[in-house]
Protein backbone atom coordinates (compact mmCIF):
# COMPACT_ATOMS: atom_id res chain seq x y z
CA UNK A 1 0.00 0.00 0.00
CA UNK A 2 2.06 3.62 -1.08
CA UNK A 3 0.70 6.43 0.40
CA UNK A 4 -0.17 9.31 -1.19
CA UNK A 5 3.28 11.16 -1.14
CA UNK A 6 5.01 8.09 -2.28
CA UNK A 7 2.44 7.67 -5.28
CA UNK A 8 2.95 11.21 -6.10
CA UNK A 9 6.62 10.88 -5.99
CA UNK A 10 6.18 7.79 -8.57
CA UNK A 11 4.16 9.39 -11.54
CA UNK A 12 6.60 12.03 -11.08
CA UNK A 13 9.48 9.70 -11.49
CA UNK A 14 7.40 8.18 -14.09
CA UNK A 15 6.41 11.03 -16.34
CA UNK A 16 10.17 12.18 -16.14
CA UNK A 17 11.23 8.92 -17.75
CA UNK A 18 8.61 9.39 -20.60
CA UNK A 19 9.75 12.18 -21.74
CA UNK A 20 12.05 12.32 -24.98
CA UNK A 21 15.82 12.69 -24.34
CA UNK A 22 17.42 15.38 -24.17
CA UNK A 23 21.07 16.96 -25.21
CA UNK A 24 23.40 16.83 -22.08
CA UNK A 25 23.35 20.13 -19.87
CA UNK A 26 27.12 21.34 -19.87
CA UNK A 27 26.31 24.82 -18.44
CA UNK A 28 23.65 25.75 -15.53
CA UNK A 29 20.90 27.55 -16.87
CA UNK A 30 20.44 31.22 -15.86
CA UNK A 31 19.59 31.91 -11.56
CA UNK A 32 20.74 27.63 -11.55
CA UNK A 33 23.89 27.44 -9.06
CA UNK A 34 26.51 25.46 -10.20
CA UNK A 35 28.00 22.62 -7.27
CA UNK A 36 30.13 20.17 -8.66
CA UNK A 37 28.88 18.41 -11.38
CA UNK A 38 25.49 19.90 -10.54
CA UNK A 39 23.26 22.80 -11.21
CA UNK A 40 21.15 23.85 -7.79
CA UNK A 41 17.80 26.14 -8.14
CA UNK A 42 16.92 27.32 -4.26
CA UNK A 43 13.52 28.63 -4.09
CA UNK A 44 12.14 31.87 -2.53
CA UNK A 45 8.67 30.72 -1.66
CA UNK A 46 7.82 27.80 0.47
CA UNK A 47 5.24 24.40 -0.42
CA UNK A 48 5.03 21.40 1.05
CA UNK A 49 7.13 18.42 -0.18
CA UNK A 50 4.76 17.36 -2.71
CA UNK A 51 4.54 20.51 -4.51
CA UNK A 52 7.94 21.07 -4.32
CA UNK A 53 8.40 17.68 -5.80
CA UNK A 54 6.08 18.92 -8.44
CA UNK A 55 7.76 22.10 -9.03
CA UNK A 56 11.16 21.00 -9.42
CA UNK A 57 9.64 18.67 -12.19
CA UNK A 58 8.23 21.44 -14.22
CA UNK A 59 11.63 23.03 -14.34
CA UNK A 60 13.18 19.79 -15.64
CA UNK A 61 14.71 18.74 -12.71
CA UNK A 62 14.03 17.00 -9.57
CA UNK A 63 14.23 18.07 -6.07
CA UNK A 64 18.20 17.23 -4.37
CA UNK A 65 19.40 14.19 -4.25
CA UNK A 66 22.54 13.52 -2.32
CA UNK A 67 25.22 11.15 -2.77
CA UNK A 68 26.77 11.91 0.77
CA UNK A 69 27.89 13.41 3.53
CA UNK A 70 30.51 15.62 1.64
CA UNK A 71 28.03 16.80 -0.97
CA UNK A 72 25.94 17.51 2.07
CA UNK A 73 27.87 20.14 3.36
CA UNK A 74 29.14 21.61 0.20
CA UNK A 75 24.88 21.99 -0.45
CA UNK A 76 24.79 23.55 3.16
CA UNK A 77 27.80 26.12 3.01
CA UNK A 78 25.14 27.31 -0.09
CA UNK A 79 22.80 28.13 2.80
CA UNK A 80 23.23 31.61 4.13
CA UNK A 81 20.56 31.68 6.42
CA UNK A 82 20.45 29.36 9.80
CA UNK A 83 17.09 29.68 10.31
CA UNK A 84 15.83 28.60 6.53
CA UNK A 85 15.07 25.07 6.13
CA UNK A 86 14.62 23.40 2.05
CA UNK A 87 13.17 20.22 1.26
CA UNK A 88 15.10 17.45 -0.70
CA UNK A 89 14.24 14.67 -2.84
CA UNK A 90 13.87 12.12 0.64
CA UNK A 91 10.74 10.90 2.16
CA UNK A 92 10.03 7.74 4.67
CA UNK A 93 8.37 4.68 2.14
CA UNK A 94 5.53 3.28 4.47
CA UNK A 95 5.59 -0.10 2.59
CA UNK A 96 9.19 -0.38 2.95
CA UNK A 97 9.96 1.40 6.40
CA UNK A 98 12.78 3.37 5.33
CA UNK A 99 13.80 6.45 4.01
CA UNK A 100 13.79 6.34 0.15
CA UNK A 101 15.14 8.67 -1.94
CA UNK A 102 12.89 9.83 -5.50
CA UNK A 103 15.18 8.03 -7.78
CA UNK A 104 13.98 5.07 -5.57
CA UNK A 105 17.45 4.34 -3.65
CA UNK A 106 17.25 3.42 -0.27
CA UNK A 107 19.20 6.56 2.41
CA UNK A 108 22.74 4.77 3.76
CA UNK A 109 22.04 5.35 7.22
CA UNK A 110 25.59 6.74 7.21
CA UNK A 111 25.38 9.31 4.84
CA UNK A 112 22.95 11.81 7.13
CA UNK A 113 22.08 12.35 10.86
CA UNK A 114 18.71 12.60 10.68
CA UNK A 115 17.12 14.51 13.52
CA UNK A 116 13.70 13.37 14.55
CA UNK A 117 10.96 10.36 13.08
CA UNK A 118 11.34 7.90 10.65
CA UNK A 119 7.39 7.47 10.33
CA UNK A 120 4.42 8.10 7.76
CA UNK A 121 4.12 11.46 5.93
CA UNK A 122 7.83 11.87 6.88
CA UNK A 123 10.15 14.08 4.14
CA UNK A 124 13.36 15.30 4.92
CA UNK A 125 14.46 18.62 5.09
CA UNK A 126 18.10 20.64 5.35
CA UNK A 127 19.43 23.61 6.84
CA UNK A 128 23.05 25.48 7.35
CA UNK A 129 23.88 22.92 9.81
CA UNK A 130 21.40 20.07 9.95
CA UNK A 131 19.22 17.40 8.43
CA UNK A 132 15.41 16.82 9.80
CA UNK A 133 12.94 15.03 9.30
CA UNK A 134 9.29 16.94 9.15
CA UNK A 135 5.57 16.29 8.05
CA UNK A 136 5.41 16.12 4.34
CA UNK A 137 2.61 18.93 4.70
CA UNK A 138 5.09 21.43 6.20
CA UNK A 139 5.83 24.41 3.71
CA UNK A 140 9.38 25.32 3.27
CA UNK A 141 11.26 26.25 1.06
CA UNK A 142 13.24 23.41 -2.05
CA UNK A 143 15.94 22.80 -4.17
CA UNK A 144 16.00 21.71 -7.27
CA UNK A 145 19.14 19.70 -9.05
CA UNK A 146 19.82 19.21 -12.59
CA UNK A 147 22.71 16.61 -13.73
CA UNK A 148 25.19 18.60 -15.53
CA UNK A 149 26.89 16.35 -18.62
CA UNK A 150 30.10 15.83 -18.18
CA UNK A 151 32.86 16.89 -21.05
CA UNK A 152 35.29 14.33 -21.55
CA UNK A 153 38.26 15.13 -24.53
CA UNK A 154 35.33 16.25 -26.94
CA UNK A 155 36.09 18.92 -29.04
CA UNK A 156 33.36 20.84 -30.49
CA UNK A 157 33.12 23.42 -33.85
CA UNK A 158 32.93 27.28 -32.79
CA UNK A 159 29.45 28.00 -32.37
CA UNK B 1 5.21 47.22 -2.39
CA UNK B 2 9.28 46.55 -2.60
CA UNK B 3 10.56 49.99 -3.25
CA UNK B 4 14.08 50.22 -4.69
CA UNK B 5 16.59 53.61 -4.60
CA UNK B 6 19.56 53.95 -6.50
CA UNK B 7 22.52 55.97 -5.24
CA UNK B 8 25.83 57.67 -6.66
CA UNK B 9 27.57 60.03 -8.09
CA UNK B 10 26.63 61.36 -10.99
CA UNK B 11 29.59 62.33 -12.94
CA UNK B 12 32.33 59.73 -13.00
CA UNK B 13 35.93 60.52 -15.19
CA UNK B 14 36.96 57.99 -17.56
CA UNK B 15 39.39 55.14 -16.80
CA UNK B 16 38.00 55.73 -13.40
CA UNK B 17 34.80 53.17 -11.60
CA UNK B 18 31.70 53.99 -11.11
CA UNK B 19 29.69 53.02 -8.11
CA UNK B 20 26.60 52.90 -7.48
CA UNK B 21 24.13 51.60 -4.46
CA UNK B 22 20.63 50.01 -4.53
CA UNK B 23 18.72 50.28 -0.83
CA UNK B 24 16.11 48.06 -0.65
CA UNK B 25 12.89 48.47 1.24
CA UNK B 26 9.48 46.75 2.25
CA UNK B 27 10.37 43.47 0.85
CA UNK B 28 13.05 40.75 1.75
CA UNK B 29 16.00 40.95 -0.07
CA UNK B 30 15.96 37.16 0.41
CA UNK B 31 13.10 36.75 -1.88
CA UNK B 32 14.38 38.04 -5.39
CA UNK B 33 16.96 37.95 -7.59
CA UNK B 34 18.30 41.91 -7.90
CA UNK B 35 19.61 43.32 -11.18
CA UNK B 36 21.71 46.28 -12.37
CA UNK B 37 20.12 47.54 -16.06
CA UNK B 38 21.15 50.34 -17.53
CA UNK B 39 19.77 52.78 -20.53
CA UNK B 40 21.96 55.08 -22.87
CA UNK B 41 20.08 58.53 -23.42
CA UNK B 42 17.83 57.57 -26.47
CA UNK B 43 18.66 53.75 -26.59
CA UNK B 44 16.90 50.84 -25.57
CA UNK B 45 17.95 48.61 -21.94
CA UNK B 46 21.02 46.29 -21.19
CA UNK B 47 21.18 43.96 -18.61
CA UNK B 48 24.38 44.15 -16.21
CA UNK B 49 23.98 41.24 -13.95
CA UNK B 50 22.26 39.81 -10.65
CA UNK B 51 23.05 38.86 -7.49
CA UNK B 52 21.16 36.52 -5.41
CA UNK B 53 21.72 37.10 -1.38
CA UNK B 54 23.66 34.23 -0.84
CA UNK B 55 26.02 36.18 -3.10
CA UNK B 56 25.62 33.83 -6.21
CA UNK B 57 25.94 36.39 -9.01
CA UNK B 58 26.00 36.12 -13.00
CA UNK B 59 26.86 39.00 -15.09
CA UNK B 60 26.56 39.94 -18.74
CA UNK B 61 29.41 38.63 -21.02
CA UNK B 62 30.16 41.56 -22.44
CA UNK B 63 30.59 43.93 -19.29
CA UNK B 64 31.67 40.89 -16.92
CA UNK B 65 35.61 41.77 -17.14
CA UNK B 66 34.68 45.24 -15.20
CA UNK B 67 31.59 44.19 -13.26
CA UNK B 68 31.25 43.53 -9.86
CA UNK B 69 28.02 43.14 -8.27
CA UNK B 70 27.80 42.90 -4.39
CA UNK B 71 25.06 42.45 -1.34
CA UNK B 72 24.76 43.91 1.73
CA UNK B 73 22.13 41.12 3.26
CA UNK B 74 22.17 43.35 6.98
CA UNK B 75 22.01 46.89 5.22
CA UNK B 76 19.40 45.56 2.73
CA UNK B 77 21.72 47.33 -0.39
CA UNK B 78 23.20 45.85 -3.73
CA UNK B 79 25.75 47.51 -5.22
CA UNK B 80 27.20 48.17 -8.71
CA UNK B 81 31.10 48.63 -9.36
CA UNK B 82 32.13 49.04 -13.57
CA UNK B 83 35.44 49.81 -13.93
CA UNK B 84 37.68 51.79 -16.32
CA UNK B 85 34.63 53.52 -17.76
CA UNK B 86 34.53 55.31 -21.17
CA UNK B 87 32.12 57.91 -22.47
CA UNK B 88 29.83 54.53 -23.63
CA UNK B 89 29.24 53.83 -20.12
CA UNK B 90 26.66 56.91 -19.88
CA UNK B 91 23.80 55.87 -19.33
CA UNK B 92 20.27 56.03 -16.60
CA UNK B 93 21.41 52.87 -14.40
CA UNK B 94 18.61 51.20 -12.66
CA UNK B 95 18.18 48.39 -10.12
CA UNK B 96 15.43 46.03 -10.45
CA UNK B 97 13.99 42.83 -8.57
CA UNK B 98 13.15 39.77 -10.43
CA UNK B 99 12.01 36.17 -9.41
CA UNK B 100 13.52 34.16 -11.74
CA UNK B 101 12.15 30.93 -12.55
CA UNK B 102 9.09 31.33 -10.04
CA UNK B 103 8.15 34.61 -11.35
CA UNK B 104 8.96 36.35 -14.54
CA UNK B 105 10.49 39.51 -15.54
CA UNK B 106 11.40 42.40 -13.85
CA UNK B 107 8.27 43.71 -11.63
CA UNK B 108 10.23 46.08 -9.16
CA UNK B 109 11.99 49.01 -10.49
CA UNK B 110 14.23 52.49 -9.05
CA UNK B 111 13.53 55.29 -10.25
CA UNK B 112 16.96 55.05 -12.49
CA UNK B 113 20.11 57.84 -12.17
CA UNK B 114 21.79 58.80 -14.73
CA UNK B 115 25.53 58.74 -14.56
CA UNK B 116 28.06 60.40 -16.51
CA UNK B 117 31.56 59.67 -17.96
CA UNK B 118 33.22 62.65 -19.01
CA UNK B 119 36.17 64.63 -18.18
CA UNK C 1 23.28 34.88 -26.36
CA UNK C 2 19.07 35.25 -27.28
CA UNK C 3 18.92 38.36 -29.80
CA UNK C 4 15.12 39.67 -30.00
CA UNK C 5 14.07 41.48 -32.46
CA UNK C 6 11.06 43.73 -32.44
CA UNK C 7 9.08 44.95 -34.90
CA UNK C 8 7.75 47.78 -36.13
CA UNK C 9 10.13 50.11 -35.40
CA UNK C 10 7.59 52.87 -35.00
CA UNK C 11 3.50 51.95 -35.07
CA UNK C 12 1.22 54.95 -35.92
CA UNK C 13 -1.48 54.44 -34.78
CA UNK C 14 -5.08 56.59 -33.23
CA UNK C 15 -6.34 55.91 -29.89
CA UNK C 16 -9.38 53.04 -30.15
CA UNK C 17 -7.03 51.47 -32.52
CA UNK C 18 -5.58 47.96 -32.15
CA UNK C 19 -1.89 47.58 -31.60
CA UNK C 20 0.06 44.42 -32.77
CA UNK C 21 3.87 44.43 -31.94
CA UNK C 22 6.24 41.40 -32.31
CA UNK C 23 9.25 40.11 -30.94
CA UNK C 24 11.31 37.58 -32.76
CA UNK C 25 13.95 35.50 -30.62
CA UNK C 26 17.30 34.37 -32.63
CA UNK C 27 16.48 30.61 -30.55
CA UNK C 28 13.92 29.53 -28.92
CA UNK C 29 13.19 30.80 -25.01
CA UNK C 30 12.69 27.85 -22.80
CA UNK C 31 9.64 27.31 -21.16
CA UNK C 32 8.04 31.24 -22.72
CA UNK C 33 10.15 33.04 -20.05
CA UNK C 34 9.64 35.95 -22.19
CA UNK C 35 8.28 39.66 -20.76
CA UNK C 36 7.00 43.15 -22.09
CA UNK C 37 7.43 46.32 -20.23
CA UNK C 38 6.19 49.83 -21.20
CA UNK C 39 8.26 52.83 -20.93
CA UNK C 40 7.48 56.47 -20.55
CA UNK C 41 9.77 59.44 -21.51
CA UNK C 42 11.53 59.92 -17.76
CA UNK C 43 10.75 56.55 -16.23
CA UNK C 44 11.54 53.32 -15.48
CA UNK C 45 9.81 50.77 -17.30
CA UNK C 46 6.68 48.65 -16.20
CA UNK C 47 6.35 45.03 -16.36
CA UNK C 48 3.63 44.04 -18.55
CA UNK C 49 3.09 40.82 -19.10
CA UNK C 50 5.44 37.33 -18.15
CA UNK C 51 5.37 33.93 -18.86
CA UNK C 52 4.39 35.21 -22.39
CA UNK C 53 1.01 35.95 -21.92
CA UNK C 54 0.34 36.24 -18.03
CA UNK C 55 -0.47 39.78 -17.20
CA UNK C 56 1.38 41.62 -14.44
CA UNK C 57 -0.40 43.05 -11.43
CA UNK C 58 -2.61 46.05 -12.04
CA UNK C 59 -2.22 46.07 -15.63
CA UNK C 60 -5.61 46.27 -17.69
CA UNK C 61 -6.74 43.08 -19.70
CA UNK C 62 -6.91 45.25 -22.95
CA UNK C 63 -2.94 43.97 -22.93
CA UNK C 64 -2.43 40.32 -24.22
CA UNK C 65 0.41 38.77 -25.16
CA UNK C 66 1.14 35.03 -26.86
CA UNK C 67 3.70 33.13 -28.75
CA UNK C 68 5.78 30.72 -27.62
CA UNK C 69 9.41 29.20 -28.92
CA UNK C 70 10.89 32.09 -31.13
CA UNK C 71 7.88 34.52 -32.09
CA UNK C 72 6.29 36.31 -29.33
CA UNK C 73 3.28 39.19 -29.72
CA UNK C 74 1.91 41.83 -27.87
CA UNK C 75 -1.76 43.06 -28.60
CA UNK C 76 -3.45 46.20 -26.95
CA UNK C 77 -6.74 45.64 -28.30
CA UNK C 78 -7.79 49.27 -27.94
CA UNK C 79 -5.65 52.62 -27.37
CA UNK C 80 -5.95 54.40 -24.73
CA UNK C 81 -3.76 58.12 -24.67
CA UNK C 82 -2.07 56.80 -21.94
CA UNK C 83 -0.55 53.54 -23.75
CA UNK C 84 1.82 55.64 -26.14
CA UNK C 85 4.77 54.75 -25.18
CA UNK C 86 7.52 52.70 -26.19
CA UNK C 87 7.26 48.73 -25.35
CA UNK C 88 10.18 46.43 -24.79
CA UNK C 89 10.12 42.46 -24.94
CA UNK C 90 12.57 40.57 -22.27
CA UNK C 91 13.68 37.00 -22.17
CA UNK C 92 14.91 35.48 -18.84
CA UNK C 93 15.54 31.93 -19.90
CA UNK C 94 19.13 32.09 -21.10
CA UNK C 95 22.02 34.01 -19.88
CA UNK C 96 22.70 37.12 -20.25
CA UNK C 97 18.98 37.84 -20.21
CA UNK C 98 18.81 40.18 -23.49
CA UNK C 99 16.01 42.97 -24.74
CA UNK C 100 14.50 43.78 -27.80
CA UNK C 101 15.52 46.95 -29.24
CA UNK C 102 12.01 48.40 -28.35
CA UNK C 103 8.69 49.67 -30.39
CA UNK C 104 7.62 52.97 -30.15
CA UNK C 105 3.88 53.09 -30.12
CA UNK C 106 2.89 56.63 -31.53
CA UNK C 107 -0.29 58.90 -31.77
CA UNK C 108 -1.11 59.27 -35.29
Known amino acids: QKSSIEKCSVDIQQSRNKTTERPGLLNCPIYWQQLREKCLLFSHTVNPWNNSLADCSTKESSLLLIRDKDELIHTQNLIRDKAILFWIGLNFSLSEKNWKWINGSFLNSNDLEIRGDAKENSCISISQTSVYSEYCSTEIRWICQKELTPVRNKVYPDS | QVQLLESGPGLVKPSETLSLTCTVS????????WSWIRQPPGKGLEWIGY???????NYNPSLKSRVTISVDTSETQFSLKLSSVTAADTAVYYC??????WGGGFDYWGQGTLVTVSS | EIVLTQSPGTLSLSPGERATLSCRAS???????LAWYQQKPGQAPRLLIY???SRATGIPDRFSGSGSGTDFTLTISRLEPEDFAVYYC?????????FGGGTKVEIK
Open chain 2, 96 to 101: ASDRGP
Open chain 2, 26 to 33: NGSIRSYY
Open chain 2, 51 to 57: IYYSGSA
Open chain 3, 27 to 33: QSVSSSY
Open chain 3, 51 to 53: GAS
Open chain 3, 90 to 98: QQYGNSPLT
